[in-house]
Amino acid sequence: NQEQVSPLTLLKLGNQEPGGQTALKSPPGVCSRDPTPEQTHRLARAMMAFTADLFSLVAQTSTCPNLILSPLSVALALSHLALGAQNHTLQRLQQVLHAGSGPCLPHLLSRLCQDLGPGAFRLAARMYLQKGFPIKEDFLEQSEQLFGAKPVSLTGKQEDDLANINQWVKEATEGKIQEFLSGLPEDTVLLLLNAIHFQGFWRNKFDPSLTQRDSFHLDEQFTVPVEMMQARTYPLRWFLLEQPEIQVAHFPFKNNMSFVVLVPTHFEWNVSQVLANLSWDTLHPPLVWERPTKVRLPKLYLKHQMDLVATLSQLGLQELFQAPDLRGISEQSLVVSGVQHQSTLELSEVGVEAAAATSIAMSRMSLSSFSVNRPFLFFIFEDTTGLPLFVGSVRNPNPSAPRELKEQQDSPGNKDFLQSLKGFPRGDKLFGPDLKLVPPMEEDYPQFGSPK
C-alpha cells in the first residue's frame, strides 16, 4: 500500500465543417533550449494560477465531498493541443494557462515533465487517429518528440478501439484506472490521451502501529470515524496564513515532491474563497524550517472522474468546443468533443525512512502539533520545478460511514479552536491583497490545539 495518484486527461476531437475565420500561420518559436530557472519559476507560478482557476470552478459545480484533479495533466493535454492551434485559439489557450504570449509552453512543460521525480512519476501520452484522417507531419513529429505520443490508428470497430484504449490506459496507470472510457462517439477523429501516474513515498514514513480510529470533524456538529496516521516527532514545515486563517504544512515525499495540506481553521469555507488570494509564493514562504511536530493525518483513498468541457468553457475556452482554429493539426476542420479527466490518490503510512532518524537531531526543540482532522485542501508539488502536480479537497474522508453527532464535552467549537491559536506569533508580511503569512518563531511553540 503506497501513496499513489493516477490522473488521466482525455481530449476527444471530432470533425468540424470548414468555415469561420481565416488565419495566418503562427511563426515557430525557438523553443529547443533547456528552460532557465527563471522560466521554470514563471511556469510554476502560471501553473499555480491555472490550478486555482480550474479547481475553483470544478469545486463550485461539484457535489462530491472529495475532489482531486491533476492540473498538470490538464495543462499537458491543452498544451499538446496548443502545438496545433493558431490565432485566437492559440491565444486563448495561452491566456487560460497564464502562459503569456510565449510560444514555448508545450516545449517547456514537456521538458520539465521529463525531469520530474524519476521513479515517482510516469507520464504517458498517446494519440488515436481516425483511420485515414490526414494529420500534418509536423504536428505528428512534434507530438512524438515532446509528448512521446506515437499516433495509433483507430480500427473503426468500436468494441476493439474501446478495448485497446482502455487496455493502454490500464497499463499506463499501472492498473489504477481500469475502465476509463465506456464508449466512443461515432465521429471521433482524434483522441488525445494524457495519463500521469504518481507513486510517492513519504520521506519519513508513519508507524502503522500508531494508526488508530479517530474522529474527523465535518463541521461544528458532526464527525466521521477515520483511520488516522500519527507521528510523535515528525519533521514538518508549517505556518499559519491569515485572512482567512489557514494552517499550512509541507509533508515531504522522496523524489523532491511535497504534499502540501491547507487546513482552514473555520468550517465555513469554500474552495474559491481559499484559492482566491493563494499564489505559489504564499505557499512557499522563505524562512520556514522543518520542526519536530506531533502529526495526525487521515489515511485517504480518493478517486474522481469528470468531464471538463463545461469548466474549460467557463474558463474561456468555449472556442475549442464550437469552432477552434486547429489548422496546425490538420487542414480538415477539427473540434474538441470531450475532455475527460480522472485521478486517484492513496495515502498510507509507507515511506522511505523512519521519522525517528531525523527527529533525534531535533529533540531539544520544543514540540508543536499539527492535526488534519477537519476539512482541508491539498496540493502535491514537484519541489525542483515548483509545478503543482495535483490539487484536491477533502470534506469527508470516509463518506460511506455514518455521521456521528459530537458529544458536547469533547467537541470544542471554532471559538475554542481559535482560542488555542492566540499565542501564535503574528507576522505582517503581506502576500497579495489581504493574505498575511505568519511563520512560527524559533522559541514560541503553542500546542496547536485541534478538536480531539
Epitope: E17, Q21, Q318, E319, A323
Partner: antibody, heavy 119, light 107 residues
Amino acid sequence: QIQLVQSGAEVKKPGASVKISCKASGYTFTNYGMNWVRQAPGQGLEWMGWINTKSGEPTYAEEFKGRFTFTLDTSTSTAYLEIRSLRSDDTAVYFCARWVPGTYAMDYWGQGTTVTVSS
Amino acid sequence: DIQMTQSPSSLSASVGDRVTITCRASGNIHNYLAWYQQKQGKSPQLLVYNAKTLASGVPSRFSGSGSGTDFTLTISSLQPEDFGSHYCQHFWTTPWTFGGGTKLEIK
C-alpha cells in the same frame, strides 16, 4: 446573405410557456454558436447564454438557469428558446445572435421577438 | 463574474462632435470586448470586436481602444445616424455580460 429570422410576437398569461424560434440561413449553422439576449422595456441588453450548435450543449447565465431552455433543430438550422412558468418580469424583447469564435462578437442578430406576459 | 461598467449612461452631443464612451471591466478581459449600436426598436449592430477591430461596413469615424480592464469607443465626428444606444460586451469567461449602455442623444 446571412439572416436570422425570429418568430412573431407572443402574448401569454402568467404561468404559461412560450417557445421562440430563430431560423438561420446563408451560412453553415453548426459552425457558429447561437446566443440569446433579453431586453426588458426601456432597459439594457442582458446576455442569457449560448448554445453550441455542434454539440447542442447550452450554457446559461446564472439568472436564466431553470425556467429557460435553449434547443436546436440542426436539420432546419433553427435555434429555440423556451420559457416556462412565465412571470410578468419576463416581458421583454428576446434576440438571437450569432457568435463568431475568433472575432469574439455577435455579428448577426435576429429582429427580436416581443413576449408580453399579462393577466 | 466579470461586471462591465459603462459611462456615461447618457450623453447629449451635436453633429460633428468628437464623442468618447468608456467601459470598465471588473477583471482582466484581455482584448475580448465588442461594441454595439442599437437604434430605437431595432436589433443591436456590431461596431467593433476584439476591442479595436472595426466590423465590416462600419464607418472609419468609429474606433475602439483599450486592453485589460479599460476600453473606449470613440466617434471622431458625430453623424445624425450615430444617435441611439451603445453597449459594450466582454467575451472572456461566461457570463458574457453587457455594459449598462450609453444613450447618445442630439443636443
